[in-house]
């Protein structure tokens, strides 16, 4: 039961995380205008991975896409790539993990197969979360670097008279969404990996079964049980015995009351 709960929770946490990564990637507020030097600006600038926006005094917001690919900073391209890789891996992970859920029955899929799929999706979630965290962190680092560079060059003009205040950018909401979402995806992935260990069929200590054959007594001990870890062979676990000895039931799976679709 604990395994099912861990797996289900891991799936839900990862699902929320990936939704957050998608939201962060699409958001326009990766960097927002720093209002420290002009808290009463009527023109507010903010930028995303795909477009930059300006909110004017009228309340109207104008956004313009980055229509160039080659003209964009390499760092921005790298962040885009990391976020997209994170989304793709996360989406595949979600797809795999749906079929891996213990509470969902698909034909005669064995626990070893589900364990394999759970581990695969868990690893995908972990990598997805790391990609998102890395992408957001690279962007944040870029912002910090640019912030201090623009602070150093901020005041231009002659004779010390301030004429132009260079627009500085600080962390936008998308960065925080991305960090949290990446963290959730990572946690979900770890939970899936933990659940995978519980799903993998382990060696069961079967009690000795004794019965009377014609004329003599033989005690059978379960020495011939072939255990599968769930990571290698996908063959059906068999108990090797002679004659018609009654054996313990195979490891039972406990279907949940609810199927998660």
């Amino acid at each position: 039961m604990a395994v099912t709960a861990c797996q289900g929770l891991g799936f839900v946490v990862s699902l929320i995380g990936i939704a957050g990564i998608i939201a962060a990637t699409c958001m326009d507020q990766w960097s927002t205008q720093d209002l420290y030097n002009n808290p009463v600006t009527a023109v507010f600038n903010y930028q995303g991975l795909w477009r930059s926006c300006v909110r004017e005094s009228s309340g109207f917001t104008e956004c313009r896409g980055y229509f160039t690919l080659l003209g964009l900073p390499a760092m921005l391209q790298a962040v885009r790539a990391l976020m997209i890789v994170g989304i793709v891996l996360g989406a595949i992970g979600l797809l795999v993990s749906i079929f891996a859920l213990k509470c969902i029955r698909i034909g005669s899929m064995e626990d070893s197969a589900k364990a394999n799929m759970t581990l695969t999706s868990g690893i995908m979630f972990i990598v997805s979360g790391l990609c998102a965290i890395a992408g957001v962190s690279v962007f944040a680092n870029m912002l910090v670097t640019n912030f201090w560079m623009s602070t150093a060059n901020m005041y231009t003009g002659m004779g010390g008279m301030v004429q132009t205040v260079q627009t500085r950018y600080t962390f936008g909401a998308a960065l925080f969404v991305g960090w949290v979402a990446g963290g959730l995806t990572l946690i979900g992935g770890v939970m899936m990996c933990i659940a995978c260990r519980g799903l993998a069929p382990e060696e069961t200590n079967y009690k000795a079964v004794s019965y009377h054959a014609s004329g003599h007594s033989v005690a059978y001990k379960p020495g011939g049980f072939k255990a599968s870890t769930g990571f290698g062979s996908n063959t059906k676990n068999k108990k090797i015995y002679d004659g018609g000895a009654r054996t313990e039931d195979e490891v039972q799976s406990y279907p949940s009351k609810h199927d998660y679709v």
Epitope: N45, S57, V162, Q166
Partner: antibody, heavy 115, light 113 residues
Framework: QVQLVQSGAEVKKPGASVKMSCKAS????????MHWVRQAPGQRLEWIGY????????SYNQKFKGKATLTVDTSASTAYMELSSLRSEDTAVYYC????????WGQGTTVTVSS | DIQMTQSPSSLSASVGDRVTMTCKSS????????????LTWYQQKPGKAPKLLIY???TRESGVPSRFSGSGSGTDFTLTISSLQPEDFATYYC?????????FGGGTKLEIK
């Protein structure tokens, strides 16, 4: 077409209050902030403040804080400005202004403060 | 607050003349986010509400005749009327649309010579 129709002229005594309205039509009222500007006789135009019809958020010129109160009734597509503790210096034409680039102005409400 | 200074305060000209008026701001009105200067020009006739002529320092509002043109960047701006028409005699105001409080210039009154 986009139009702002303001309430009629008001004559008030010093210390009194006045509430004027600005009815918007021809556009989605919540799309743009509603700004208020005044013009005293022979003076330059002065920005009073604005209200965001979406959330009722306001921003005021420091000079008019405590003097002007901006409100909206989105269901009626109408913005209001109330001026309190009127003095003779508040005698002016008050305009509501909206849309992008602050392109559309009301016809103005003349407020005369006289004892 | 950003101070807006217009010059001259009044100007006499004849129909057909080319007229130029200037507006200076105490701080730059240039927004690096979209590379625009947030300066607006209005025309006001007696007893009427101001009418938008130019926004972003040089972009003409739709319906405004092409004889009106705006130029300038940062802190120095100019409004030019290439060939004065009788209906152009009015007061012209520049406005800072970049920083709150939004501020207006004192106006340039264009009179018939």
């Amino acid at each position: 077409q986009v139009q702002l129709v303001q309430s009629g002229a008001e004559v008030k005594k010093p210390g009194a209050s006045v509430k004027m309205s600005c009815k918007a039509s021809g556009y989605t009222f919540t799309d743009y902030n509603m700004h208020w500007v005044r013009q005293a006789p022979g003076q330059r135009l002065e920005w009073i403040g604005y209200i965001n019809p979406n959330n009722g958020g306001t921003s005021y010129n420091q000079k008019f804080k405590g003097k002007a109160t901006l409100t909206v009734d989105t269901s009626a597509s109408t913005a209001y400005m109330e001026l309190s503790s009127l003095r003779s210096e508040d005698t002016a034409v008050y305009y509501c202004v909206t849309t992008r680039y602050l392109a559309v102005w009301g016809q103005g409400t003349t407020v005369t403060v006289s004892s | 607050d950003i101070q807006m200074t217009q010059s001259p305060s009044s100007l006499s000209a004849s129909v057909g003349d080319r007229v130029t008026m200037t507006c200076k701001s105490s701080q730059s009105l240039f927004n690096s986010g979209n590379q625009k200067n947030y300066l607006t020009w209005y025309q006001q006739k007696p007893g009427k509400a101001p009418k938008l002529l130019i926004y972003w320092a040089s972009t003409r509002e739709s319906g405004v005749p092409s004889r009106f043109s705006g130029s300038g960047s940062g802190t120095d701006f100019t409004l030019t009327i290439s060939s004065l028409q009788p209906e152009d005699f009015a007061t012209y105001y520049c406005q800072n649309d970049y920083s709150y409080p939004l501020t207006f210039g004192g106006g340039t009154k264009l009179e018939i010579k």
